[in-house]
């Protein structure tokens, strides 16, 4: 008995598409072995039509594909533009065609449903609008017009020109009689339901001279598009519902059991807690289309998603919809990276961001997710030397360690830095990842003076105290600029006396600026790293002033000025326009993506992502 399973019979009609899913035990060998779809010949052989190794028979060219979903133990054969010639016996299987790891499938393609003569066929998607046109002759111009639906053997009145409307159609049907020149009336039904499908009869007049026209209404429920994305990666659902619903509330929901479709996000401001920090609903175009981006994909995100339009912002009967079946591949190419990073007020965090290593030359970005309205992600820094003004001196994006990971360092942390941040590039859009920064109780580990003033032409020495826990780390000083932080020479001055209960392994490392010039003014960071992996940093602003009295300045912790007040966000800021988040190529060339006006917000409350993958910041 073969362990492969699938549909034994598939029945369809000419011109249609079929999507045949074959199930196999998801062992390691099975997941990676060849998958095939072959047609059984009269003499017992089976001729391959398509396989997972890229082969496509000329009979299937341009109309079929085979997709393997190893995590689920399934593969799917899609065949479009069916003809009666496609009827026959097939096998879906694994390995070699003749080896028996297969399942027999009978495909029968018929000519299509038999219809009454002179029947007009209307094929319309669920939730959309249909207009059934009913011609009549002059003698019936003044007579009653009506539309009936055939229910079993009996015609049931749906609507007529005297004002009757069948209760099943209330609020979504109208009968239009064209001007006197046209001998035609129309019945318009919107918010189509599956139950609306069937045979209709329109009639002008009620006697033996009445004009009749048959109509066959087929209401199509969208077959889910199969979407297969990597764990920890990103997915974008593009939803095009048509201009007729351009002004209706849009939603994305995820089907749970039965009819329930739990709203994930909608344009009325609702967002499911599980997607906090990792979802954007991109604003709709004039044609009513929109898209939803979800990052940091989890195993439990897999399932069936519907997008639609309804004034309630949720799925209702008659909502026009699109459907997707999302599979989340746990054998992900996207490496694990902490989803939560913790830092203390005044301290720092170093965030590792994965990217597709094949795209090392891509532009790297870091943005701050904001939940207001439908969510957006204003850009904070990029790898081309742009830093948002209010983050100058405390934010840097470094290409290190490279080979598929870049680093973002943020220091001088305050409670307002708590929130969700996205790592992304202008390359592979599937590699968007999310990290939550949490501000916890504690003191920064590195101790530096607050603001420091240097005197032109003199020497300045700035201390940085490293506790013993960093004894094995490389210690450095660097000067911050918007392209990174350029390393500077520094001196180890021996053990630090700034820490209680810290032995000889603590260190005082000083930065010395000789013959200070105006160019020395700016932000300086001291920090620790191990190889290309960065740890904590502390920032000092050095101001330069004219000489008042001779001598050199040696700054101690006690003499240092108070830490500068935190800069308040100003109103002009760069934001990834939602289109650009969807496809960062849109802003690869132009730095000023959008100059939206925004007010400084208050402290951002953060929502725990429930992840165990946490990375400590300044306090461990």
């Amino acid at each position: 008995k073969s362990p492969i399973f699938g549909p034994e019979e598939v029945n369809s009609v000419e011109g249609n598409s079929v999507s045949i899913t074959c199930y196999y035990p998801p062992t390691s060998v099975n997941r990676h072995t060849r998958k095939y779809w072959c047609r059984q010949g009269a003499r017992g052989g089976c001729i391959t039509l398509i396989s997972s190794e890229g082969y496509v028979s000329s009979k299937y060219a341009g109309r079929a594909n085979l997709t393997n979903f190893p995590e689920n133990g399934t593969f799917v054969v899609n065949i479009a533009q069916l003809s009666q010639d496609d009827s026959g016996r097939y096998k879906c299987g694994l390995g070699i065609n003749s080896r028996g790891l297969s399942f027999d499938v009978s495909l029968e393609v018929s000519q299509g449903p038999g219809l009454l003569n002179d029947t007009k066929v209307y094929t319309v998607d669920l939730g959309r609008t249909v207009t059934i046109n009913c011609p009549f002759k002059t003698e019936n111009a003044q007579k009653r017009k009506s539309l009936y639906k055939q229910i079993g053997l009996y015609p049931v009145l749906v609507i007529d020109s005297s004002g009757y409307v069948n209760p099943n159609y209330t609020g979504r049907i109208r009968l239009d009689i064209q001007g006197t020149g046209q001998l035609l009336f129309s019945v318009v039904i919107n918010q189509l339901r599956l139950s609306d499908a069937g045979q209709y009869l329109c009639q002008a007049g009620d006697d033996s001279n009445s004009n009749k026209k048959n109509a066959d209404l087929q209401v199509l429920k969208p077959e889910p598009e199969l979407v297969y994305e990597d764990l920890r990666g990103s997915v974008t659902f593009h939803c095009a519902l048509g201009p007729e619903v351009a002004n209706v509330a849009k939603f994305l929901c995820r089907q749970s059991s039965g009819e329930n479709c739990d709203v994930v996000v909608n344009t009325l401001g609702k967002r499911a807690p599980a997607f906090e920090g990792r979802i954007l609903l991109n604003p709709q175009d004039k044609d009513g289309s929109f898209s939803v981006v979800i990052t940091g994909l989890r195993k439990e995100d897999a399932g069936r998603y519907l997008c639609g339009a309804h004034s309630d912002g949720q799925l209702q009967e008659g909502s026009p919809i699109q459907a997707w079946q999302l599979f989340v591949n746990e054998e992900s190419t996207i490496p694990r990276s902490p989803t939560v990073v913790k830092g203390v007020a005044g301290g720092s965090v170093a965030v590792l961001c994965p990217y597709n290593r094949k795209e090392s030359k891509s532009i790297k970005y870091w943005c701050l997710w904001e939940g207001a309205q439908n969510g957006r992600c204003p850009l904070l820094v990029d790898s081309e030397g742009w830093v948002k003004a209010q983050y100058e001196g405390r934010l840097s994006l470094l290409e290190e360690p490279g080979n598929g990971t870049f680093t973002v360092i943020l220091n001088q942390l305050t409670s307002r830095d708590a929130g969700f941040y996205w790592c992304l590039t202008n390359g592979d859009t599937l590699w968007r990842t999310t990290v939550e920064i949490k501000i916890i109780e504690g003191e920064p580990n590195l101790k530096v003076p607050g603001n420091v003033t240097a005197v032109l032409g003199e020497t300045l020495k700035v201390p940085c105290h490293f506790p013993c826990k960093f004894s094995s780390y490389e210690k450095y000083w660097c000067k911050w600029n918007n392209t990174g932080c350029q390393a500077l020479p520094s001196q180890d001055e021996g053990p630090s006396k700034a820490f209680v209960n810290c032995d000889e392994n603590s260190r005082l490392v000083s930065l010395t600026l000789n013959l200070v010039t105006r160019a020395d003014e700016g932000w300086y960071w001291c920090g620790v790293k191990q190889g290309h992996f960065y740890g904590e940093t502390a920032a000092v602003y050095v101001a330069v002033e004219e000489r008042k009295a001779a001598g050199s300045r040696d700054v101690s912790l006690a003499k240092a000025d108070a830490a500068p007040d935190e800069k308040v966000l100003d109103s002009g800021f760069r934001e990834i326009e939602n289109k650009a988040i969807q496809d960062p190529r849109l802003f690869a060339e132009e730095k000023a993506v959008a100059d939206t006006r925004d007010q400084a917000d208050g402290s951002r409350a953060s929502v725990d992502s429930g992840s165990s993958e946490e990375q400590g910041g300044s306090s461990r």
């Epitope: 034994e8 029945n11 599956l194 087929q218």
Partner: nanobody, 126 residues
Framework: EVQLVESGGGLVQAGDSLRLSCAAS????????MGWFRQAPGKEREFVAT??????????YYADFVKGRFTISRDNAKNTVYLQMDSLKPEDTAVYYC?????????????????WGQGTQVTVSS
């Protein structure tokens, strides 16, 4: 809410036939597939057959033990699914349950089905 009502069960001799019906009522949007499962005394509920549809395309799935003997079909207009059972055997004795799902998933998986009928008893005597 969708209600499923099974009928057509009964007591028959081995080799005889029975036709089970499952009528769906209530809000049937957007049902994806309907199927039959069975549960013999002291055994777990098991998959028998499922029919899935999309527009004018339909897919029929069967358990190995019923292949060639049972046929699943549906009447779209009546929202009804049938299970024609031929060449019945004593081991086919069980309560037969109708189930419906809206999810695209393995049709054999019990947990894929959100809606269940009360069941109809089929007894096959030797």
């Amino acid at each position: 809410e969708v209600q499923l009502v099974e009928s057509g069960g009964g007591l028959v001799q081995a080799g005889d036939s029975l036709r089970l019906s499952c009528a769906a009522s209530g809000r049937t949007f957007p049902t994806y597939a309907m199927g039959w499962f069975r549960q013999a005394p002291g055994k777990e509920r098991e998959f028998v057959a499922t029919i899935r549809w999309s527009g004018s395309t339909q897919y029929k799935y069967y358990a190995d033990f019923v292949k060639g003997r049972f046929t699943i079909s549906r009447d779209n207009a009546k929202n009804t699914v049938y299970l024609q059972m031929d060449s019945l055997k004593p081991e086919d004795t069980a309560v037969y349950y109708c189930a419906a799902t809206t999810l695209l998933t393995d049709p054999r998986a019990l947990n894929a089905y959100a809606y269940w009928g009360q069941g109809t008893q089929v007894t096959v005597s030797s």
